[in-house]
């Protein structure tokens, strides 16, 4: 689609005669016709088939044609058309005399013609005028011409439709040609196709807009490149989404089990080496002058009782010193001058001659100890109890009282939360940093599995031995009915077989 | 050949919220070159533009319905809903689903055969 | 709000030329879709881009759009084509459908 445009400049008809050279009465009253149509090798009378365009009178005689084109679009004259441009054309420019105020043809006489003129050729599609003179015995007429597409047409041919848009269906502009020329920020053959933020990721990221980067499910970060891991994962890390790979020294589904304590939280004090015994369990061995769980109470170096044979302890910078009672010598007064016959042993220990009688030995009686019998026995000056736990001495015998959490003669056993089997329903126990989490079988839920869901408690068969299950409505359990023989919430014990339990 | 099938209840009472979705076949919802759009058509009215999205989930309203519009897509399901809150009688209408072709201009190529919804207590 | 108005009606007797207008502001400047929709049935694209056919519609249907006019016309109308026609165009983000022409 595009216009055939033609602007008349100048008309000379100097005598103001028509074209059968008679004079026109009172001077010539000018109009044109113009008739567009295809190429023709020699221009002959016919259907304008390019269109028609006829003028009012312009002029008399001589006259130049001013532009009108503000005024009405007289000047230069407009010659549609709704189809490809060929490129050639034959065009007939035909000046009229008017008699009167009827211009059409058939109101006309034969006549009253002036000029006829005829061209064809090639003409392009462009914006520049082509300028032409036709001159004839008595007249000559100056006009120019061009061919434009139509608004939104474009191409050579004034064929391709192209329309600028800015909604979802094109972000573009159009090129002379009738190519898209999209705008900032959008590609894709249409222009609809957003260009996501530099560097977001083409597989994890996407944008609806440009320069956005949002992130498809189990993605993060600002170019969508970050994997989310496992939600509640503590210390892990992913390399796809929903892993929880545990960092080094931590374990468990959501890596929040605390395999090295000692690294971690470094507990043991004045230089103390920490030794990991389990999960969130450790044991410090303190240097010498410490004691305490984390090595944290400084400790005299007389506490130990170095001092044998009733010697006394004083401290000192740089260690401790014995004053030994009469009869004895030696850094811990452990050397005798006594013999037996001095009834050395106290507590009732028995006394028993060395080396031909120049020393002795006391044999203690239980509760005793010490080069004399002399000391009770402290079963608990050795720090025995691990993990914080309160040594009791218990007569002969001591006992290490553990703090929540542990177990065992010394508390040298973390206990599991698991250990009591909280989970109901044969649900599995998971240790966790804060408790517990029971994983339950099918037909159970809540936090220790206790509640049945739409499963009938017996579908499992949970009783042995030939035993009716009842399904108890009320608590949601099962009943075993054992046969003759068997007994145990389940039917499990022959009768007469005691149950070994784990504990 | 694409097709599309509405589905949904076809009595909503007023107040509530119409719900119906949209089911693809015969071809992929996750193309850049289309639209997914709803149209309706009040009993011997004219044809009434709701809204559309394409398969990442950006959407366009009519203004004049967008508060309570909402039209969502499941590229799973191949399928894309619409959901039309505090419903009144002028909402009575059958409801299209159409595909609205980039290459095309925007021209709803396929359509649904339409469902009736009415509103009513 | 952007509006496209179309004549409620339009008669032609079969085998001659139906025209159909649908008038909005600067209407040519956007492109236009027609559709075709017979009673009882969902709306068929007859012709999208101004004046472009989808495969399958007949050479009697076409369409221009300049100015503030879009026409599709029918040339050699049959009986089969009696029917509802609404003009429709986007406005920026929105689908706009003209109030629709019954040709009979």
């Known amino acids: 689609s595009g216009v055939f445009q033609l602007q008349l400049q100048e008309f000379i008809n100097e005598r103001g005669v028509l074209a059968s050279g008679r004079p026109c009465e009172p001077g010539c009253r000018t109009f044109f016709r113009v008739c567009l149509k295809h190429f023709q090798a020699v221009v002959s009378p016919g259907p304008c088939t390019f269109g028609t365009v006829s003028t009012p009178v312009l002029g008399t005689n001589s006259f130049a044609v001013r532009d009108d084109s503000s005024g009405g679009g007289r000047n230069p004259l407009q010659l549609p058309f709704n189809f490809t441009w060929p490129g050639t054309f034959s065009l007939i420019i035909e000046a009229w005399h008017a008699p009167g105020d009827d211009l059409r043809p058939e109101a006309l006489p034969p006549d009253a013609l002036i000029s006829k003129i005829a061209i064809q050729g090639s003409l392009a599609v462009g914006q520049n005028w082509l300028l032409d003179e036709q001159t004839s015995t008595l007249t000559r007429l100056r006009y120019s011409y061009r061919v434009i597409c139509s608004d939104n047409y474009y191409g050579d041919n004034c064929s391709r439709l192209c329309k600028k848009r800015n909604d979802h269906f094109g972000h573009y502009v159009c090129q002379p040609d009738g190519n898209l020329s999209c705008l900032p920020g959008w590609t894709g053959e249409y222009c609809q196709q957003p260009i996501c933020l530099s560097g977001c990721h083409e597989q994890n990221g996407y944008c609806s807009k440009p320069a956005e980067c949002l992130c498809r499910p189990g993605w993060q970060g600002r170019l969508c490149n970050e994997c989310i891991p496992h939600n509640g994962c503590r210390h892990g890390t992913c390399s796809t989404p929903w892993q929880c790979t545990c960092d080094e020294g931590w374990g468990g589904l959501f890596c929040d089990q605390d395999l090295n304590y000692c690294t971690h939280h470094s507990p043991c004090k004045n230089g103390a080496t920490c030794s990991n015994s389990g999960q969130r369990s450790y044991t410090c061995t303190c240097r010498p002058g410490y004691t305490g769980v984390d090595c944290e109470l400084e400790l005299s170096e007389c506490d130990s009782n170095p001092c044998r044979n009733g010697g006394s302890c004083k401290d000192q910078e740089d260690g401790y010193h014995c004053l030994c009672p009469p009869g004895y010598y030696g850094l811990h007064c452990e050397h005798s001058t006594l013999s037996c016959a001095d009834s050395p042993c106290f507590n009732g220990g028995s006394c028993r001659e060395r080396n031909q009688g120049a020393n002795y030995a006391c044999e203690c009686p239980p509760n005793f100890t010490g080069s004399n019998c002399e000391k009770k026995v402290d079963r608990c000056t050795s720090n025995p109890c691990a993990n914080g736990g309160q040594c009791l001495n218990r007569g002969p015998s001591r006992m290490c009282r553990c703090r929540p959490g542990f177990t065992g003669t010394y508390c040298e056993l973390h206990v599991s939360d698991c250990a009591r089997n909280p989970c109901a329903h044969g649900g599995t126990c998971h240790d966790l940093e804060n408790g517990l989490m029971c994983t339950c079988p099918a037909g159970f839920s809540g936090r220790r599995c206790e509640v049945r869901t739409s499963i009938d408690a017996c579908a499992s068969s949970p009783c042995f031995n030939r035993a009716t299950c009842y399904t108890d409505l009320s608590t949601d359990t099962f009943v075993c009915n054992c046969p003759y023989g068997f007994v145990g919430s389940r039917c499990e014990f022959p009768v007469g077989l005691p149950p070994s339990f784990p504990w | 050949e694409v097709q599309l099938q509405e589905s949904g209840p076809g009595l909503v009472k007023p107040s509530e919220t119409l719900s119906l979705t949209c089911t693809v076949s015969g071809g992929s919802i996750s193309s850049s070159s289309y639209y997914w759009g709803w149209i309706r058509q009040p009993p011997g009215k004219g044809l009434e533009w709701i809204g559309d999205i394409n398969y990442i989930g950006s959407t366009y309203y009519n203004p004049s319905l967008k508060s309570r519009v909402t039209i969502s897509v499941d590229t799973s399901k191949n399928q894309f809903s619409l959901k039309l809150s505090s419903v009144t009688a002028a909402d009575t209408a059958v409801y299209y689903c159409?595909?609205?072709?980039?290459?095309?201009?925007?021209?709803?190529?396929?359509w649904g055969q339409g469902t009736l919804v009415t509103v009513s207590s | 709000s952007y509006e496209l108005t179309q004549p409620p009606s339009v008669s032609v007797s079969p085998g001659q030329t139906a025209s159909i207008t649908c008038s909005g502001d600067?209407?040519?400047?956007?492109?236009v879709s027609w559709y075709q929709q017979k009673p009882g049935q969902s709306p068929v694209l007859v012709i999208y881009e101004d004046s472009q056919r989808p495969s399958g519609i007949p050479e009697r249907f076409s369409g221009s759009n300049s100015g503030d006019t879009a026409t599709l016309t029918i040339s050699g109308t049959q009986p089969m084509d009696e029917a509802d026609y609404y003009c429709q165009a986007w406005d920026s983000e929105t689908g706009v459908f003209g109030s629709g022409t019954k040709v009979t």
């Open positions: 600067m209407l040519g400047d956007k492109y």
């Open positions: 159409a595909r609205e072709s980039v290459p095309l201009g925007g021209g709803a190529d396929e």
